[in-house]
């Protein structure tokens, strides 16, 4: 007996799709060998239709695919737009068609059920609304209009124009008779139930002159859309429930083992704590549609999700829903990066953000997740250089190390910086990731003066002390601007050779400005890095004065409150999804720090590289 297993018989109807799962023992050889779906011919040969190596036969082009799930020992063959010609005997297997491991599958595609002539078919999901159209002749215009449901050989009255309503349809059905001249009446049924499924008969008038029209109502439980996403990546559930529920509370829930549905998030402010920091419910469009984004996907996020509408913000029978089955692929293309980064008060963090390496030209963003109401994510910085005003001098987004990773540096940390941040781009939305910044006890490793006032035309020397553990790191000074941090020449004054006794006090790197000009005023960062991987940074503000003043004065721009017109990652997620960003920075106007002219030698050059660095604290 072959160890490959699958469905022995698959039956469907024309125009439908099938999803055939085949199971195999997940040995390392089996996991990586070729998978195929072939059709057995009269000669006994089995002709490949689709394989895991990318082959798709001409009559399957555009309607079939094969997906391997090596970690599970399964592969899935999806075939759409079935026709009667697809009926036949097939094999799903591993290796070579003629020999190797396989399983026989019989596929039968039929025409679908026979219906009375002229029957109109209405296919609607449970909870939605259907409008059944019933034509009639002029002579029946003044006569009784009615809708019956056929149950076996009998017809049960559902509604009529004399105000009768069958109790099973109470409060969710209406019969509309148009004005004169229109020879059609309609029956509207809201909040469809599975039990509404069946054959209906419209009738106008009575006796031999009556008008009749058959309607076949197919009420479907929404078929879960299969969604496959990578571990650590992001998923977006787009939920369009129709105008009828545009003003009703919306929710996303996850079906549990008891068959109830636990609310993940809703528009009434409820959110499952397991999704803290990594979920947003985007405000609805006028048509009532909305979307939910979940980042930092975990294996335990797998399951069946339903979105729906109900005034209670949770699942209720007979209300519209949409369904997804989420699978999280552990063999992820998204690299591992720390989900928690720790820094000390006054110190810094350097966060590595993954992006799709095929999209090196995409715009990069970093936003702060806020949990209030449905969640939002105001953008703090972007690769075009715009930085939220209150982050001036302490936040920068760098293209390094490149090749699928960018870096965000935040310094002058306070306890208020603790929270969840999202890395994202205007490209592949599945690469959105979440990082939590935690502020822990400790001292910054890099020490710079707190107040620096430079005198115009004179020489200024700013020291930056670093501990012995950074002796092998590259040290640098840079001048911060809202487009980056331009590296400046600096002098490492500590011994550069390997040493036995590390004198903490002698380890310093200095920045010299000679002569000081007006353009030198601003924020300067002292930092350490290894190649293109950034470590800690410390920031110092340099004020420039006309003449020498007794004592020193520290000039610091006051930290601004959050701009009321800040840009926010909310409904804009949709625009990113649709790649239809006119303003790719995600909606609403935004106050930005104006570029302050000459930035000491132009903007920082970025260099592409790869690999990874620990993410941790830094200095002020």
């Amino acid at each position: 007996k072959s160890p490959v297993f699958g469905p022995q018989e698959v039956s469907s109807v024309e125009g439908n799709s099938v999803s055939i799962k085949c199971y195999y023992p997940p040995t390392s050889v089996n996991r990586h060998t070729r998978k195929y779906w072939c059709r057995k011919g009269a000669s006994g040969r089995c002709i490949t239709l689709v394989s895991s190596e990318g082959y798709v036969s001409s009559n399957y082009a555009g309607r079939a695919n094969l997906t391997n799930f090596p970690e599970n020992g399964t592969f899935v063959v999806n075939i759409a737009q079935l026709s009667r010609d697809d009926s036949g005997h097939y094999k799903c297997g591993l290796g070579i068609n003629s020999r190797g491991l396989s399983f026989d599958v019989s596929l039968e595609v039929s025409q679908g059920p026979e219906l009375p002539n002229g029957t109109e078919v209405y296919t609607v999901d449970v909870g939605r609304t259907v409008t059944i159209k019933c034509p009639f002749k002029t002579e029946n215009a003044p006569k009784t209009k009615a809708l019956y449901k056929k149950i076996g050989q009998t017809s049960v009255l559902v509604i009529d124009s004399r105000n009768y309503v069958n109790p099973n349809y109470k409060d969710r059905i209406r019969l509309r008779i148009p004005g004169t001249g229109q020879l059609i009446f309609t029956v509207v049924i809201d909040r469809l139930r599975l039990s509404d499924h069946g054959l209906y008969l419209c009738q106008a008038g009575d006796g031999s002159n009556r008008d009749e029209k058959n309607a076949d109502l197919q009420v479907l439980e929404p078929e879960p859309e299969l969604v496959y996403e990578d571990l650590r990546g992001s998923v977006t559930f787009h939920c369009a429930l129709g105008l009828e529920v545009a003003n009703v509370a919306k929710f996303l829930c996850r079906v549990n083992s008891r068959e109830t549905c636990d609310v993940v998030i809703n528009t009434l402010g409820k959110r499952d704590s397991a999704f803290e920091g990594r979920i947003l419910l985007n405000p609805q469009d006028k048509d009532g549609s909305f979307s939910v984004v979940i980042t930092g996907l975990r294996k335990e996020d797998e399951g069946r999700y339903l979105c729906g509408a109900h005034s209670d913000g949770q699942l209720q029978e007979g209300w519209p829903i949409q369904a997804w089955q989420l699978f999280v692929n552990e063999e992820s293309t998204i690299p591992r990066s720390p989900t928690v980064v720790k820094g000390v008060a006054g110190g810094s963090v350097a966060v590595l953000c993954p992006y799709n390496p095929k999209e090196s030209q995409s715009l990069k963003y970093w936003c702060l997740w806020e949990g209030a109401q449905n969640g939002r994510c105001p953008l703090l910085v972007e690769s075009q250089g715009l930085v939220q005003e209150q982050y001036e001098g302490r936040l920068s987004l760098l293209q390094e190390p490149g090749n699928g990773t960018f870096t965000v540096i935040l310094n002058q940390l306070t306890t208020q910086d603790a929270g969840f941040y999202w890395c994202l781009t205007n490209g592949d939305t599945r690469w959105r990731t979440t990082v939590e910044i935690k502020i822990i006890e400790g001292e910054p490793n890099l020490k710079v003066p707190g107040n620096v006032t430079a005198v115009l035309g004179e020489t200024l020397n700013i020291p930056c002390h670093f501990p012995c553990k950074f002796s092998s790191y590259e040290k640098y000074w840079c001048k911060w601007s809202n487009t980056g941090c331009q590296t400046l020449p600096s002098q490492d004054e500590g011994p550069s050779e390997a040493f036995v006794n590390c004198d903490e006090n002698s380890r310093l790197v200095s920045l010299t400005l000679n002569p000081v000009t007006r353009a030198d005023e601003g924020w300067y960062w002292c930092g350490v890095k290894q190649g293109h991987f950034y470590g800690e940074t410390a920031a110092v503000y340099v004020a420039v004065e006309e003449k020498k003043v007794a004592g020193s004065r520290y000039v610091s721009p006051a930290k601004a409150d959050a701009a009321p017109d800040e840009k926010v990652l909310d409904s804009g997620v949709r625009e990113i999804e649709n790649k239809a960003i006119q303003d790719p920075r995600l909606f609403a106007e935004e106050k930005v720090v104006a570029d302050t002219g000459d930035q000491a030698g132009g903007s920082r050059a970025s260099v592409d590289s790869s690999s990874s660095e620990e993410q941790g604290g830094s200095s002020k």
Partner: nanobody, 130 residues
Framework: QVQLVESGGGLVQTGGSLRLSCAAS????????MGWFRQAPGKEREFVAA??????????YVGDSVQGRFTISRDAAGNTVYLQMNSVKPEDTAVYYC?????????????????????WGKGTLVTVSS
């Protein structure tokens, strides 16, 4: 809560036929898959057959030991599943359990694995006499 009730078990002679039924009921229960397992005294629970559906599409799975002899089907409403047992053998003697699943779960879930089914009936005894 979901209830599964099996019926149709009993005594049958070798080579004979029997038809088991399993009815699902409970709050808004419309299963996604239903199946049959069996357990002979002192043995592990064994997969017999399963049927899974999605709209107008149906998938039928049959265990190796009953292939060609047993067939699985369901009623139009999808709440009752049948196991048609033909050409029965003494080794088919066992308690037959109905199983059901409301949710299409992870791609790795194998219908042959009892752990992957959410709901179970109490069982019906089938005895095949020689």
């Amino acid at each position: 809560q979901v209830q599964l009730v099996e019926s149709g078990g009993g005594l049958v002679q070798t080579g004979g036929s029997l038809r088991l039924s399993c009815a699902a009921s409970g709050r808004t229960f419309s299963p996604y898959a239903m199946g049959w397992f069996r357990q002979a005294p002192g043995k592990e629970r064994e997969f017999v057959a399963a049927i899974r559906w999605s709209g107008a599409t149906t998938y039928k799975y049959v265990g190796d030991s009953v292939q060609g002899r047993f067939t699985i089907s369901r009623d139009a409403a999808g709440n009752t599943v049948y196991l048609q047992m033909n050409s029965v053998k003494p080794e088919d003697t066992a308690v037959y359990y109905c199983a059901a699943d409301r949710v299409p779960k992870d791609i790795s879930i194998d219908p042959r694995n009892p752990k992957d089914w959410d709901y179970w009936g109490k069982g019906t005894l089938v005895t095949v006499s020689s």
